[in-house]
């Protein structure tokens, strides 16, 4: 008789990830961002959908809005007026572009528990917000701005020239929303609600992108969007400010544009209120290497805004474009004139500087061969910021506090040693005056959100620790992840490798490169994720690698600006270099290497497949850019200049995917695009397909009808299932 076979019980119950797990979002995590309403209070939507106020000092919770009230108007969002008298409830959410949406708004009176009747808001509204003090309302309806002194009052119409696709007041047009402001709004209240500043975008002369939306009707609709492609006519922007106490007195007053900006095509990049009577505007030349920060003051006698030349601060890049992805915004100190700002130091690393009078005399606050990434808050005695300084890993984020009240200023890492293995990538959210703050850790372990005392940094409580996720993952064979670097020809290539659970260095594995690679992006980050590539490693036994090459962010200007005016060259070279290094490691089956990417990553993966190296057996491009002449002016020209003979037309032409059509002959190529992509137009893939057909090159393709750049909903499931089949076929893996 044989004794029964003893199984390792742990291994026996462990299972690999399935594609279904990923598509169902089985292993998604939660974060907790308090909706701060004071120094010690925040609002949060409870599991049962009540809006609950939590007072940190008393430790007590209070329901301020019941789930029944929310449900009575099908509200999916809310906003409390600063005087706590009213809440707006948002329903009928209808997405437009990346940030923009329209909605129906109801105002609920918290003092009597009833909805405000009379002078109801029109629908649908494009944007609505409370004043920072009291309960004034500003909103945008049909591209015009309206003001209410109280929710029940009749509205005062501020602008009258708003017109669909022509004039946008208080909201950005497509290109400003996507590539400059990264918001759905273009209006800003002054700190006490005295003034309201807003942008007017004139798109009258902008060429229109038109595409079919098939819907269910007999005839497709045509979507028309004023969309300036590289070199095309751009929107014309003006900034106005109106006194909201007496809006009819002098009406909106235009803020003057600095002379050195106004002399040629320009952009408005951001507005920051300093006090109720001082505002800071940032402007950018169309050739985006010169930015001007202009501080303007209200002149009571003339009821106008004055922007003296002495309060203009110029930021210029001689090696690339101004700023990182965007030009950074200032954080003003309590004297209401000096400010803190992140820009490149003399060594080419983005660092915090303190500007008191001129940029030339700026005092550098942080320094080193790493980068300051975000300034969260400046108080009387502390400045909180994030950086990737700790242990020299560019893909980490820790939160630091610099004491600015004492000299010399002392620096403390708030997060570096909190949960060292679990947490290496943080963001933070601060209450008024930084009395308390929440830390949100994104990984590499399971994300956790915690509440801290702003004075002592002491942890007060755990807000969200994802216990259910932790339990659910106990019987899952997750892949192993490692973040390392390759040193190649004076360039450091950081990579993340995702390895199958039972990885054995002596075996050979298929390799999939996931690439984005766009300017100022970063893919190699110490964050937690259970996603499609996790499944490919866990279940299908692939090795997946992500590589940050030239053009990527947070490692200094040398790497970042290497791609300036030359997109599509070094990003591709660096992916190829990394693949060669991976092959040298000995565990990659060099006959089974694939590359895939989305958007900019689709562009890079396409160029890598068409590089003629013979390294890649197959690859996928989802919604790729195929020619920089087809993409948005603001983004493209930042990195490429203009597509004119006397500027950079030659490289625009040389860097297309179509120019390399012949080189796809020896690879398996899957091209995917949504037909209603407002961002990277279907035109890009249509032109690739046409070039491949004309070159008589076989390829595979999938379109997603009426889907945009995100390929969401049921399309997501179809997409990942389709790509999985493609890769498994390419790698000769059985289904």
């Amino acid at each position: 008789l044989r004794p029964p076979r003893v199984h390792n019980s742990e291994e026996n119950t462990m299972r690999a990830l399935t594609l279904k797990d990923i598509l169902n979002g089985t292993f998604s995590y939660k974060t907790f961002f308090p909706n701060w309403i004071s120094g010690q209070e925040y609002l949060h939507q409870s599991a049962d959908n009540n809006i609950v106020l939590y007072n940190i000092e008393t430790g007590q919770s209070y329901t301020i809005l019941s789930n029944r009230t929310m449900k009575s108007v099908n509200a999916s969002n809310y906003g409390l007026s600063p005087d706590r008298q009213f809440v707006y409830l948002e329903s009928d959410y209808s997405k437009l572009w990346r940030y923009s949406y329209t909605a129906t708004y109801y105002i609920y009176d918290l003092s009597n528990g009833e909805f405000v009747r009379g002078n109801e808001l029109p629908r649908p509204i494009q944007y609505l917000c409370w004043s920072p003090v009291g309960s004034k309302l500003a909103y945008v309806y049909q591209n015009n701005i309206y003001l209410k002194q109280r929710p029940g009052d009749p509205p005062f119409q501020i602008t009258f020239n708003g017109r669909e696709n022509k004039i946008f007041n208080g909201i950005p047009d497509w290109v400003y929303e996507e590539e400059m402001l990264a918001t759905k709004y273009a209006l800003w209240w002054s700190p006490n609600g005295k003034f309201l500043a807003y942008a007017e975008f004139n798109d009258t002369d902008i060429p229109v992108i038109a595409y079919s939306y098939y819907g269910d009707e007999q005839y497709p609709r045509t979507i028309n969007i004023p969309y300036p492609k590289a070199g095309a006519k751009n929107p014309f922007v003006r900034i106005f400010i109106i006194d909201t106490t007496y809006p009819a007195y002098v009406g909106p007053q235009e803020v003057p544009v600095p002379a050195m900006i106004a002399s040629s095509d320009y952009y408005f990049s951001w507005l920051t209120w300093v006090t109720d009577e001082r505002v800071c505007l940032q402007w950018l030349k169309r050739v985006q290497n010169v930015s001007v920060l202009s501080i303007c003051d209200f002149r009571e006698d003339w009821q106008t805004w004055d922007c003296p030349k002495t309060q203009e601060h110029i930021e210029e890049s001689r090696t690339g474009w101004a700023g990182g992805f965007f030009v950074s915004t200032p954080v003003f100190s309590y004297d209401a004139i000096s400010y803190y700002k992140i820009f490149s130091d003399k060594d080419g690393y983005k660092h915090i500087h303190y500007i008191k009078d001129t940029v030339e005399n700026a005092i550098q606050i942080t320094s080193g061969k790493w980068e300051a990434i975000n300034i969260f808050r400046v108080t009387q005695d502390s400045l909180f910021y994030s950086s990737n300084e700790f242990e020299d890993y560019p893909g980490r984020r820790n939160i630091y506090r610099i004491s600015i009240g004492s000299y010399p200023p002392s620096k403390k890492c708030v997060t570096c040693h909190l949960r060292k293995e679990r947490c290496q990538y943080y963001t933070a959210s601060f209450s008024d005056y930084a009395k308390y703050y929440a830390l949100v850790c994104y990984g590499p372990g399971i994300p956790i959100s915690t509440l801290h005392d702003g004075r002592t940094d002491q942890e007060i409580k755990i807000l969200e620790e994802n216990k259910e996720l932790e339990n659910a993952l106990k019987n899952i064979q997750l892949p192993k992840e490692e973040i390392k670097k390759l040193e190649v020809d004076e360039i450091t290539l950081w990579y993340k490798m995702i390895l199958p659970p039972q990885f054995d260095r002596s075996k050979k594995y298929p390799l999939l490169i996931q690439v984005y690679g766009g300017p100022c992006s970063q893919s190699v980050r110490s964050v937690f994720a259970v996603n499609w590539i996790s499944y490919l490693a866990s279940k299908e036994g692939m090795v997946i690698a992500l590589v940050d090459g030239r053009g990527t962010a947070f490692q200094g200007d040398k790497l970042l600006y290497a791609v300036y005016r030359k997109l599509g060259v070094y990003e591709v070279e660096d992916q190829i270099t990394a693949v060669r290094k991976f092959i040298e490691m000995g565990f990659i089956d060099e006959k089974r290497i694939a590359i895939w990417g989305w958007s900019y990553g689709g562009y890079v993966s396409s160029l890598a497949l068409a590089s003629g190296t013979g390294l890649f057996k197959c690859g996928i491009a989802v919604a790729p850019v195929s020619s920089w002449e087809y993409y948005a002016s603001v983004y493209t020209e930042r990195f490429m200049g203009l597509p004119t003979k006397d500027d950079n037309l030659e490289h625009y032409k040389n860097s297309t995917v179509m120019a390399r059509a012949e080189y796809f002959r020896n690879v398996d190529y899957l091209l995917i695009h949504g037909t209603a992509d407002d961002n990277v137009h279907f035109q890009n893939s249509a032109q690739i397909a046409k070039a491949l057909v004309n070159a008589q090159v076989d390829f595979q393709a999938m379109w997603y009808s009426d889907q945009n750049h995100g390929l969401s909903g049921l399309s997501t499931n179809h997409l990942y299932t389709h790509m999985t089949h493609f890769l498994k076929q390419c790698f000769s893996l059985s289904d």
């Epitope: 004071s38 120094g39 007590q60 919770s61 209070y62 329901t63 301020i64 019941s66 600063p82 706590r84």
Partner: antibody, heavy 119, light 111 residues
Framework: EVLLQQSGPELVKPGASVKIACKAS????????MDWVRQSHGKSLEWIGD????????IYNQKFKGKATLTIDKSSSTAYMDLRSLTSEDTAVYYC????????????WGQGTSVTVSS | DIVLTQSPVSLAVSLGQRATISCRAS??????????INWFQQKPGQPPKLLIY???NRGSGVPARFSGSGSGTDFSLNIHPMEEDDTAMYFC?????????FGGGTNLEIK
């Protein structure tokens, strides 16, 4: 109409305990916290504590910790306050009040329950 | 604990005239632009009734002749014009800090 109906007057001996009930009607009990206040004869008002009905989470005036215990019975829409180790000093009228958290205001009050501690 | 001192302790005002009751806190009760000072009216044998919350907001059904103002440590309740029905005890109360505390009360009557 919002109504907080409190239980009747109590006459108890020193050292004894008493449980005062407060039945809420005209609104949903779980939508507001319930606070308790006492008023000794001819004196001002003293805040005892607060309960969050959804979880039963409480906060107390330090002075009443160990003296008062606040609870909620959601099924009957009733809040309770237990008072123990009573002395003559605890002779007072005890009120339950609906607490509107967003404004930190006691907006509706029960009619009061008179507690007399006497041997 | 925050101590609230009301003055005067008692006050007699003619019908139609203005009654002003003051409330001084031992420390600031301002909370980031808001002051959680409430005022109550209590008539004999009745529970207190909320008149004013958050310094200056009238409770539901409270007539416009009642108004509140103040910030920091000094607050006041105004009644104008005084009516017969306003004879009562008035209490201020702070909810800025636990334990919530009440003033000693002001007895208002008709002159």
């Amino acid at each position: 109409e919002v109504l907080l109906q409190q239980s009747g007057p109590e006459l108890v001996k020193p050292g004894a305990s008493v449980k005062i009930a407060c039945k809420a009607s005209g609104y949903t009990l779980t939508d507001y916290n319930m606070d308790w206040v006492r008023q000794s004869h001819g004196k001002s008002l003293e805040w005892i504590g607060d309960i969050y009905p959804n979880t039963g989470g409480t906060i107390y005036n330090q002075k009443f910790k160990g003296k008062a215990t606040l609870t909620i019975d959601k099924s009957s829409s009733t809040a309770y306050m237990d008072l123990r180790s009573l002395t003559s000093e605890d002779t007072a009228v005890y009120y339950c009040t609906r607490f509107r958290g967003i404004h930190y205001a006691m907006d509706y009050w029960g009619q009061g329950t008179s507690v007399t501690v006497s041997s | 604990d925050i101590v609230l001192t009301q003055s005067p302790v008692s006050l007699a005002v003619s019908l139609g005239q203005r009654a002003t009751i003051s409330c001084r806190a031992s420390e600031s009760v301002d909370n980031y632009g808001l002051s959680f000072i409430n005022w109550f009216q209590q008539k004999p044998g009745q529970p207190p009734k909320l008149l004013i919350y958050g310094t200056s907001n009238r409770g539901s059904g409270v007539p416009a002749r009642f108004s509140g103002s103040g910030s920091g440590t000094d607050f006041s309740l105004n009644i104008h014009p005084m009516e017969e029905d306003d004879t009562a005890m008035y209490f201020c109360q702070q909810s800025n800090e636990v334990p919530y505390t009440f003033g000693g009360g002001t007895n208002l009557e008709i002159k």
